[in-house]
Structure formats: structure tokens, C-alpha cells
């Protein structure tokens, strides 16, 4: 993840970056809305490896909690938000069935707007 | 990935997203910054699986390639810019080693800003 | 860089308890696996036990299966090694040796002794 | 549990001669290897893992090779800071994670 504070920039909205195993995930949402048990270790060729997913959200602590930076505030709300990707994980469904699922991983904290009415 | 404008918001970077194939991808950059080849198939227990990869990257004919939305232009400059993460593949190194590495792909568009010196 | 400080050995008494403490800097010690790496005097390496990022999984070595107790505070980047109902054979150097996201140690403190005698 | 065997238990050499620690298996681990180096009075430092890819920082004179059961740690030219006992470690499957012996390097 890129550090745009080395090149004298601040970001719209602060985040903080982190690698997650499947010991502390244990669930997740894949694609069709259902929840699902992340496996711990995944067979690889001739070997086992932990899952780990490298997972980015919005910085509860960060000085962007209360809005977006640098937003021009006489047209705009402003609100910094996680969202979401998809990675491949070795899963087991409700129904004990063990597969490859593309699963929804915390991956950036972004900034979304609302326009202000009624000024 | 949430889409803001559900929610009647807007994005202060619009991007795109595509699901991308190792096919297509060849190449990526692992940890430790080296070229590897990514792999087209996976193999698993009962068969292989192609690599796919869920890539989201700011969007070159969208309104914000000029600059982010909504920021103060009185005291920001400000970039829409593609971040990166790592997601585990099955990649083959310079030495033609195999195995699952972390490599970087695209995942995010955020905006960056500098403030506007000397006004 | 990465730091990892050992503290809390001594000389215990069969059938006592002891808690070790490693402090940890230099990283997000909240992204890693972290472990207790123990050898005895004069002899090898030994794995103890592991525990995971936010403290979700934990393992132990058979040797020290319900007696040893591995937890974390992340809030303090802090490891622990609690450990009951010791014996002479638990008599080592303790490590802290942190997991690199394949399984292998790339960080190690440099130990505390534990002495467990009569 | 998997069993790792290094050999010999010590090897006497001069500043110079070049060192061949092996590590042996007691099942296939493909390349699920590290090799460690512990000085007296040290903490253990990682050298290789993937059984051949060094770690940062580690001179080019120490070489890792193997895979399955049979790995082999090269110094290629001892130099007087490199005699100490070297440690292998499987990763393969866990846990545990298991350790050889140690091969102890000493100065002839």
C-alpha cells in the first residue's frame, strides 16, 4: 500500500493497513451474500500455509473520523469509508462443503460525498 | 465493492473495477519488489482453478482525472491515484521457482492532496 | 527496526508458575504471528507455542499442552508465556521469535532464562 | 511430527575452507526449509528459508540447496564470524514446527 506522506501528500481520508489471518477472521461474505467459515491452513503443493489477507479500513483514530480532509465544506458533507474487495479463500459453506470462494475483505478507506441543500 | 451512489453519493474519485485473469495480468510485483510470473492455473484438490484477481483502479475518462471532487481548490491541489494491496498467488520467480507469493495488485482509487503554497 | 525484549525468567520451584514477557516495536505487531522459541542449556531449539495477530489461534507444543498459556495485548505490543505447573525439564532460555507470514522466524529477542530446580 | 537429522553434529574447518551443513527429513517437506546461525550467548538469525532464498542482508557466501527430504547449507569460504551452530527448521507442516539439531562450525 503505497504512503502518499513520503512525497509531502496527505490523503483524503486516513487509514490503517494490516495483515489478518483466518485464526482471527474465521468468517466471512463471499459473492452471494452468504457467510462462511475461513479455513486456517491451505493445502499447497506438497505443504500448508496460513491464510492471511492484507486488509485496509478507515483509521477510527485518525484525524478524518469526523469527515473527509480538504473537502470544500460550503457544498459538500463529506464521510471517509471502507470499502471492499474480493480475494480468493479456501472456505467451508453452511453446509460443510470446503471450496475455493471469492470472499469481501476490508482493502481501502475512501471518501464519498453528499450534496448540501437548503443553503 | 460498495457503490456509493446507491446511497445518492457521490465518489471523490471515480474508478473501475474488473475481475483479471492471470492470463492477462502475466507479471506482478511480489514483496520484496521482484518481477515474478503469475501462474494461469491453480491446482486444487479436484481439478484447477484459473487465478483471478478483483483489480480496481481510478478511472482515465472519469470527471476526476483532472483533480479530486469536492476538494478546496483555494487551498489544495489534489490526485486521484490508483493504491495497491497483496493478495497470495501462485507465481514463478526469475529462477523459475515456484510457489504462493504475495503480489501486489491494483485495489482502490483515493485522492491525495498538497497544499497550495505562496497563494 | 525490529525489537523484541524477553523479560520475566528466574528461579522457580518445581510445580510453580512464572509469567514471561516479550515487548515488541519496530512493526505492526498486530499484523503477526508471534512465538515462544525455548533451549535448553546446551541443547537445541524447541518450539513452544504460536499465537496469531489479534490472538484468535493459538497453538502449543504437546510438551507443554495445558500448562503453558500464550496471550497478547496488542494495545502495548506486548507477547506473554504463562506458565504453571513447571517442571526441571522446562529449565531454558525462552524466546520471542516473530513469524513471517510463511511460517519461518525472521526476528528473535535475545531470551530469558528459566531455571526451574529443588 | 516431522523429524529433522543435521549432520555432522560438529565440523572443525579453517577460515577459508568451505562448509557443507546437511539437514535430512524424516518426510517430504518440498522446500519448506530455514536455516538459522546462533552465536554463543545469541539469538538464533535467520539465513535462508524457502530452502535456498537468503534472507536480508545475509553475505552471498552462505548458499541453501535441497528439497523433499535432503538439504544442504553451503558457507563457501568460512570466514572467522561465521563459526557458530547453524539450525535448520521445517514449515512444511505444523504444528509443530520442528528444528534439527544444530551442526556446531568450529575454527580447526
Known amino acids: 500500500h503505497s504512503d502518499p506522506a513520503r512525497r509531502g501528500e496527505l490523503s483524503v481520508c486516513d487509514s490503517i493497513s494490516e495483515w489478518v489471518t483466518a485464526a482471527d477472521k474465521k468468517t466471512a461474505v463471499d459473492m452471494s451474500g452468504g457467510t462462511v467459515t475461513v479455513l486456517e491452513k491451505v493445502p499447497v503443493s506438497k505443504g500448508q500455509l496460513k491464510q492471511y489477507f492484507y486488509e485496509t479500513k478507515c483509521n477510527p483514530m485518525g484525524y478524518t473520523k469526523e469527515g473527509c480532509r480538504g473537502i470544500d465544506k460550503r457544498h459538500w458533507n463529506s464521510q471517509c469509508r471502507t470499502t471492499q474487495s474480493y480475494v480468493r479463500a479456501l472456505t467451508m459453506d453452511s453446509k460443510k462443503r470446503i471450496g475455493w470462494r471469492f470472499i469481501r475483505i476490508d482493502t481501502s478507506c475512501v471518501c464519498t460525498l453528499t450534496i448540501k441543500r437548503g443553503r | 465493492h460498495s457503490d456509493p451512489a446507491r446511497r445518492g453519493e457521490l465518489s471523490v474519485c471515480d474508478s473501475i473495477s474488473e475481475w483479471v485473469t492471470a492470463a492477462d495480468k502475466k507479471t506482478a510485483v511480489d514483496m520484496s519488489g521482484g518481477t515474478v510470473t503469475v501462474l494461469e492455473k491453480v491446482p486444487v484438490s479436484k481439478g484447477q482453478l484459473k487465478q483471478y484477481f478483483y483489480e480496481t483502479k481510478c478511472n482515465p475518462m472519469g470527471y476526476t482525472k483532472e483533480g479530486c471532487r469536492g476538494i478546496d481548490k483555494r487551498h489544495w491541489n489534489s490526485q486521484c491515484r490508483t493504491t495497491q494491496s497483496y493478495v497470495r498467488a501462485l507465481t514463478m520467480d526469475s529462477k523459475k521457482r515456484i510457489g504462493w507469493r504475495f503480489i501486489r495488485i491494483d485495489t482502490s482509487c483515493v485522492c491525495t492532496l498538497t497544499i497550495k503554497r505562496g497563494r | 527496526d525490529v525489537q523484541l525484549v524477553e523479560s520475566g525468567g528466574g528461579v522457580v520451584r518445581p510445580g510453580e508458575s512464572l509469567r514471561l514477557s516479550c515487548a515488541a516495536s519496530g512493526f505492526t505487531f498486530s499484523s503477526f504471528y508471534m512465538n515462544w522459541v525455548r533451549q535448553a542449556p546446551g541443547k537445541g531449539l524447541e518450539w513452544v507455542s504460536g499465537i496469531s495477530g489479534r490472538g484468535g489461534g493459538t497453538d502449543y507444543a504437546d510438551s507443554v499442552k495445558g500448562r503453558f498459556t500464550i496471550s497478547r495485548d496488542n494495545s502495548k505490543n506486548t507477547l506473554y508465556l504463562q506458565m504453571n505447573s513447571l517442571r526441571a525439564e522446562d529449565t531454558a532460555i525462552y524466546y520471542c521469535?516473530?513469524?513471517?507470514?510463511?511460517?519461518?522466524?525472521?526476528?528473535w529477542g535475545l531470551g530469558t532464562l528459566v531455571t526451574v530446580s529443588s | 511430527e516431522i523429524v529433522l537429522t543435521q549432520s555432522p553434529g560438529t565440523l572443525s574447518l579453517s577460515p577459508g575452507e568451505r562448509a557443507t551443513l546437511s539437514c535430512r527429513a524424516s518426510q517430504p517437506i518440498n522446500r519448506y526449509l530455514a536455516w538459522y546461525q546462533q552465536k554463543p550467548g545469541q539469538a538464533p538469525r535467520l539465513l535462508i528459508y524457502?530452502?535456498?532464498t537468503r534472507a536480508t542482508g545475509i553475505p552471498a557466501r552462505f548458499s541453501g540447496s535441497g528439497s523433499g527430504t535432503e538439504f544442504t547449507l553451503t558457507i563457501s569460504s568460512l570466514q572467522s564470524e561465521d563459526f557458530a551452530v547453524y539450525y535448520c527448521?521445517?514449515?512444511?507442516?505444523?504444528?509443530?514446527?520442528?528444528f534439527g539439531g544444530g551442526t556446531k562450525v568450529e575454527i580447526k
Open positions: 524457502d530452502a535456498s
Open positions: 527448521q521445517q514449515y512444511y507442516d505444523w504444528p509443530p514446527l520442528t
Open positions: 521469535a516473530k513469524e513471517t507470514l510463511n511460517i519461518f522466524f525472521d526476528y
